[in-house]
């Protein structure tokens, strides 16, 4: 059995304040069954950045077409970046359950925010 891989190819991304940041994440398999979620930070205090089914995330949009079949690209775009958005972002695969159980995290992508050019 090939083990599911959660791939965040960029270790770091630098974006100018006011611009959009793209955080890339792909998975190697459609199974196990379960959702992908994005978080900033790790551990119990981490902040949920994007979850398709629950919550309202007006600045975050999926990069891939939401009607694309058998999607394995879970990259997101965050608009209007501010210095407060700096941090390490993790793409996390969950196994479906009651509740869903965290299965595997990507290695993380550190987002740094540059001052807006004058």
């Amino acid at each position: 059995e090939e083990e599911l891989q959660v791939i965040q190819p960029e270790k770091s991304v630098s974006v100018a304040a006011g611009d959009s940041a793209t955080l890339n994440c792909t998975v190697s398999s459609l199974i196990p069954v379960g959702p992908i979620q994005w978080f900033r930070g790790a551990g119990p205090g981490r902040e949920l950045i994007y979850n398709l089914k629950e919550g309202h995330f007006p600045r975050v949009t999926p990069v891939s077409d939401p009607t694309k079949r058998n999607n394995m690209d879970f990259s997101i775009r965050i608009s209007n970046i501010t210095p407060a958005d700096a941090g390490t972002y993790y793409c996390v695969k969950f196994r479906k359950g009651s509740p869903d159980v965290e299965l595997k995290s990507g290695a993380g992508t550190e987002l740094s925010v540059r001052a807006k050019p004058s």
Epitope: S29, I31, G34, L52, K53, D65, N70
Partner: antibody, heavy 120, light 108 residues
Amino acid sequence: EVQLVESGGGVVQPGGSLRLSCAASGFSFSIYAVSWVRQAPGKGLEWVSTIGADDTYYADSVKGRFTISRDNSKNTLYLQMNSLRAEDTAVYYCAKDSTVGWSGDFFDYWGQGTLVTVSS
Amino acid sequence: EIVLTQSPATLSVSPGERVTFSCRASQNVRSDIAWYQQKPGQAPRLLIYAASSRDTGIPDRFSGSGSGTDFTLTISSLQSEDFGVYYCQQYYDWPPFTFGGGTKVEIK
């Protein structure tokens, strides 16, 4: 071309057992979830079970009696049915799961079905 | 468990007519609805997913709409090969996946 071919159906007495198989071809079997859906004579569709990797899901009506499994080396899906009841009589379809976007699963390809009759 | 209610149970239609099927969910399922066609003695066939996306090879006379709890499948001009039973399915919250009871389309 995606193909799903079920086998193993037949007549069995109440309390008996049966093992269904579904041979898959035309897609990368090992990376997709696959499911069993049944249809009692003259009735509608009822989901039975789904398997991802080692993750399995069952309808309450079959939990504890049916076991879904897969052999990726043989591209084959199985359904072991024990303690069969008259109400399990149905055509059993094997179905390939498909996902859309970041969302849940539906069934984009179906086999032709195999009839299971539970009768004394 | 999310219950899907399809109406009407049976439709008697003449070829060339416009046909509309209804599927109502007992709670919000967003757009996570699929529609299937089943002809007698055959397996179901996927028509629509994500409420409104046509599957590959499905004629454009089939269209789906709706979100939340109310969904519609429309056949703009019924062809003779379209007779059969139509089922909706939700995949927003599972297990279990649930199907509607079906709408049978028969010749008037």
